[in-house]
């Protein structure tokens, strides 16, 4: 199947890659640069101009060009300047600023907590199944199976540290070799990048915002997939990661130190442990074929236990199993002996919500999954709203310049590497790459950070999470120290290798181009984002898993033709864009194939048919919510709520009313003015920090 043309061509000019993009003549020819292009490229784009005579906004003198959807929106100020405020206004403004900061930190806190709870929920829903994935004996011989198991388990438990710790315990107990563990670690690296992709989906309401957010999130996915694509075959052929890490581990005489620091968890744990607490050892025990663990609940009930070494009478199958001949007897039915056993006495129950409900893991998991996703979504929306109101004017300018500006000329190349260090440092502080990249996603969406800058930050995040793992390994007990350190180092060098592949030379920064391509498609066909998630994180890994279980012949038999077709399509795509004359006329484009094989338009029509019945009730509800939201936060009446309001949007566009979300609008005053709803800025609501 040929690729959809949108994927390969992430170019600055949207008309080059957007299907059926048409343009009407500008109203005022001399100022044709000013466009307010709607996201919906299916209908003619209305370009309009705000004539100075109608405008109350004095902030904008030159109309800005927004042709490139990847250009960051200018979040401009519509408030009264600080110098123009009276004492009361200044005090009010300071309190407003403090209030916003507290709210922002509060929502950020609950956002991080909800990610933690989401991880627990996934573990409750799929943790035991994930554990059973690991107990598959084929992992040893099949690196591809190891890779997909790493992906699937991490996706199911929503935590690479959980899957990594299972691998460590399996290596430590000789159930798995380091060689077999490396592909699993690579898979875990891929699996962990699903979290921020899910977070990006929460910004689906606004096309341009979603375009940036989704591309910013998937840049992580593409980096991981591409790294594996190159480094897994290299590792299978040379075992360089295994060899290098073994040399490092053997050259140091490590002494296991104290516990690794729990930086962010110190703040979030008190709250999350009131929601649910999990006994993560159960998943590891299942992975290690412990039959007793299969019936154990993951929900921790007893938090305070007393472990005592005592001589205990235990039954044995025969006299031969007795600890000593003198310590053996029968009660007429069973044979008993005395053994030194560690006896665990339950002292105090945990203090979380589910401790006394005795619900099955699946039920608790589903409840937490729904709640955490709702909280995650709510917090994200509020964070975006608060940031949108805070990041205006000079504040936005300062932040955007700080984050996105390069160093002066000879050292410009160093900026990206500093960003990598910042990403690593921040991830080390929050102790989770998922948390860091998920926090980054809305910032990319609202246009504070460019994708070009988010990319090295994400790469740094990958490094940061491995340094955390190395620290945790150094703090692990003697019996697991070697294996956990070697695996943590494998993870570290894998990410370093990936960075060396896909960062230093600008030309090799393929993940950015691929993410932008996907961002363009997803902005136009929003269903494709979910389609991408399902395909890349579930369908492909599960297919490979199934084929691997069927054996090498089946895997090769199916895999080779598929890989061959993909390579053929990519080569053809490359020739079509670079030197089409080399190709026969028929192959210079994809028109020789049925439309459904090279365009998403027919698929969109099919999906619209299926989702059609759900759109109207959703739309009514959405409009009500939208109006309430507009009343509360002063957004324009026609703000976009979701894809299901498309009919409304198109109707308004036909009347010349632009439909834009306030966050991506240059100026709130302008957006109101465009609808003939001009009002003077209210000193109570509009406030500039600088």
């Amino acid at each position: 199947m040929a690729p959809w043309p949108e994927l390969g061509d992430a170019q600055p000019n949207p008309s080059k890659y957007l299907e059926g993009a048409t343009s009407q003549q500008p109203i005022t020819p001399d100022k044709s640069k000013e466009t307010n292009k709607t996201d919906n490229t299916e209908v003619p784009v209305t370009k309009f101009e705000l004539l100075p005579t109608y405008s109350t906004a004095t902030l904008i003198e030159e109309p800005t060009e927004v042709d490139d959807p990847w250009n960051l929106p200018t979040l401009q100020d519509s408030g009264i300047k600080w110098s123009e405020r009276d004492a009361k206004g200044k005090i009010l403004c300071v309190f407003q600023g403090i209030g916003r900061l507290i709210l922002l930190l509060g929502f950020l806190y609950f956002f991080v907590c909800s990610l933690d709870v989401l991880s627990s929920a996934f573990q409750l829903v799929g943790g035991k199944m994930a554990g059973q994935f690991f107990s598959n004996s084929s992992i040893m011989s099949n690196p591809l199976l190891g890779l997909v198991i790493g992906v699937l388990v991490t996706v199911f438990v929503q935590s690479s540290s959980t899957s990594t710790s299972i691998v460590v315990s399996m290596v430590a107990s000789s159930l798995l070799t380091v060689r077999a563990a490396i592909p699993i670690i690579m898979g875990a690296n891929i699996g962990t990048s699903i979290t921020n992709t899910i977070v990006a989906l929460m910004q689906v309401g606004d096309r341009s915002e979603f375009r940036r957010a989704f591309a910013g999130a998937t840049v992580h996915d593409f980096f991981n997939w591409l790294s594996v694509l190159v480094l897994l075959p290299v590792e299978v052929a040379t075992h360089y990661l295994e060899v290098v890490t073994q040399l490092i581990v053997e050259s140091f005489h490590f002494k296991n130190g104290e516990d690794a620091p729990d930086l962010l968890k110190v703040i979030t744990k008190p709250f999350t442990k009131l929601i649910v607490q999990l006994d993560k050892k159960v998943i590891s025990q299942i992975a290690m074929n412990d039959e007793t663990a299969k019936n154990k609940s993951l929900v921790k009930i007893w938090c305070k236990t007393f472990t005592n070494m005592t001589q205990m009478n235990v039954t044995v199958p025969s006299m031969a199993n007795c600890t000593s001949p003198s310590l053996c007897w029968t009660d007429g039915i069973q044979i008993w002996t005395m053994k030194n056993v560690t006896y665990k006495e339950n002292i105090a129950k945990c203090q979380h919500i589910f401790v006394n409900f005795h619900l099955p893991d699946l039920a608790v998991g589903i409840i937490l999954l729904i709640i955490s996703l709702l909280v995650l979504c709510g917090c994200l929306i509020m964070i975006v709203k608060i940031l949108g109101s805070v990041l205006k004017g000079q504040v936005a300018t300062v932040i955007k310049k700080t984050i996105n500006t390069d160093f002066p000329f000879p050292f410009a190349w160093l900026t990206g590497y500093l960003a990598i260090l910042v990403g690593a440092g921040m991830t080390f502080i929050v102790q989770s790459s998922s948390v860091f990249t998920s926090a980054l996603t809305p910032l990319i969406g609202i246009g504070v950070i460019t994708i070009e800058r988010a990319y090295p930050l994400t790469l740094g995040s990958n490094i940061g999470t491995t340094t955390t793992a190395i620290l945790a390994a150094l703090a692990s007990p003697g019996n697991t120290l070697r294996s956990s350190l070697q695996i943590a180092l494998c993870h570290f060098f894998f990410n370093i290798s990936g960075i060396l592949l896909w960062y230093p030379i600008p030309f090799t920064r393929l993940p950015i181009r691929m993410a932008k391509g996907l961002g363009n498609i997803s902005a136009k066909y929003r269903w494709f984002a979910i389609f991408y998630l399902i395909i890349f994180f579930f369908l492909i890994p599960l297919t490979v898993f199934g084929l691997s279980l069927a054996g090498w012949p089946v895997l090769v038999g199916v895999g080779v033709p598929v890989v061959f077709i993909i390579i053929l399509v990519l080569c053809l795509r490359l020739l079509q864009s670079r030197c089409p004359r080399v190709l026969p006329k028929k192959l210079q484009n994809w028109n020789f194939l049925p439309l459904c094989m090279h365009s998403l338009k027919p698929w969109d029509a099919v999906i619209s048919k299926f989702t059609g019945p759900f759109q109207m009730p959703c739309c009514c509800c959405c409009r009500v919510c939208c109006r309430v939201c507009c009343l509360l936060c002063g957004c324009p009446k026609c703000c976009r709520c979701s894809k299901c309001c498309q009919d409304l949007e198109e109707g308004q566009e036909a009347q010349g009313v632009p439909v834009k979300a306030p966050e991506t609008f240059d100026n709130i005053t302008i957006s109101r003015e465009a609808q003939g709803e001009v009002r003077a800025p209210d000193s109570k609501t509009e406030c500039t920090a600088l």
């Epitope: 009478n313 053996c328 007429g332 039915i333 069973q334 044979i335």
Partner: antibody, heavy 120, light 107 residues
């Protein structure tokens, strides 16, 4: 206090069967094993078998296997011993005794005994 | 099955005398031996378990010793209420087996 109260004396015909009950009180029935021991007139003690009421696991002495059936009713904390195909040599006093499960203290409490007379 | 042989089968002695009853196992039973007292017309009562551990409420004049195959029950000072038949029992392996018994009488 700990009590094991057995059913009354039985006079039965050869070839028939007898069911002796042992009602317990004063302790957790499921935490113990109930053993059955018989004592023929002027003879020593002979172990018949035992049952773990908690899981109904039983064990019998070889020569009682197939003839003796041990059961336990957790709801009434009562153990039963049924002996079939009775012969004159089965005439004896049948005792039930408890043994603390997972412990080596032996049979620390006995019932008063049930006299079974096999006579035509 | 492990055979438990008790000796003597009966003994007659005076109040205050020291009484020793022995029990020999046909094979090594470690220390998995118990001693019971059965008074005429009554059910047996546990005296000693694990060869030498006195059961709750058993007077101190009763003591047990031995390991492997040879075991001893000692009554340091015979009392009139000690008139009974004494049985040893092994619980090293199944089936549980008892000794033939030793009848203790007072002259």
């Amino acid at each position: 206090q700990v009590q094991l109260v057995q059913s009354g004396a039985e006079v039965v015909k050869p070839g028939s069967s007898v069911k002796v009950s042992c009602k317990t009180s004063g302790f957790f029935f499921t935490e113990y094993i109930i053993h059955w021991v018989r004592q023929s007139p002027g003879q020593g003690l002979e172990w018949i078998g035992g049952i773990i009421p908690n899981n109904d696991v039983t064990n019998y002495k070889q020569n009682f296997r197939g003839r003796a059936t041990l059961t336990a009713d957790k709801s009434t904390s009562t153990a039963y011993m049924e002996l079939s195909s009775l012969r004159s040599e089965d005439t004896a006093v049948y005792y039930c005794a408890r043994w603390r499960n997972a412990y080596y203290s032996a049979m620390d409490s006995w019932g008063q005994g049930t006299t079974v007379t096999v006579s035509s | 099955d492990i055979q438990m042989t008790q000796s003597p089968s009966s003994l007659s002695t005076s109040v205050g005398d020291r009484v020793t009853i022995t029990c020999t196992a046909s094979q090594d039973v470690g220390t998995a031996v118990a001693w019971y007292q059965q008074k005429p017309g009554k059910s047996p009562k546990l005296l000693i378990y694990w060869a030498s551990t006195r059961h709750t409420g058993v007077p101190e004049r009763f003591s047990g010793s031995g390991s492997g195959t040879d075991f001893t029950l000692t009554i340091s000072s015979l009392q009139p209420e000690d008139v009974a038949t004494y049985f040893c029992q092994q619980y090293r392996t199944s089936p549980l087996t008892f000794g033939g018994g030793t009848k203790v009488e007072i002259k």
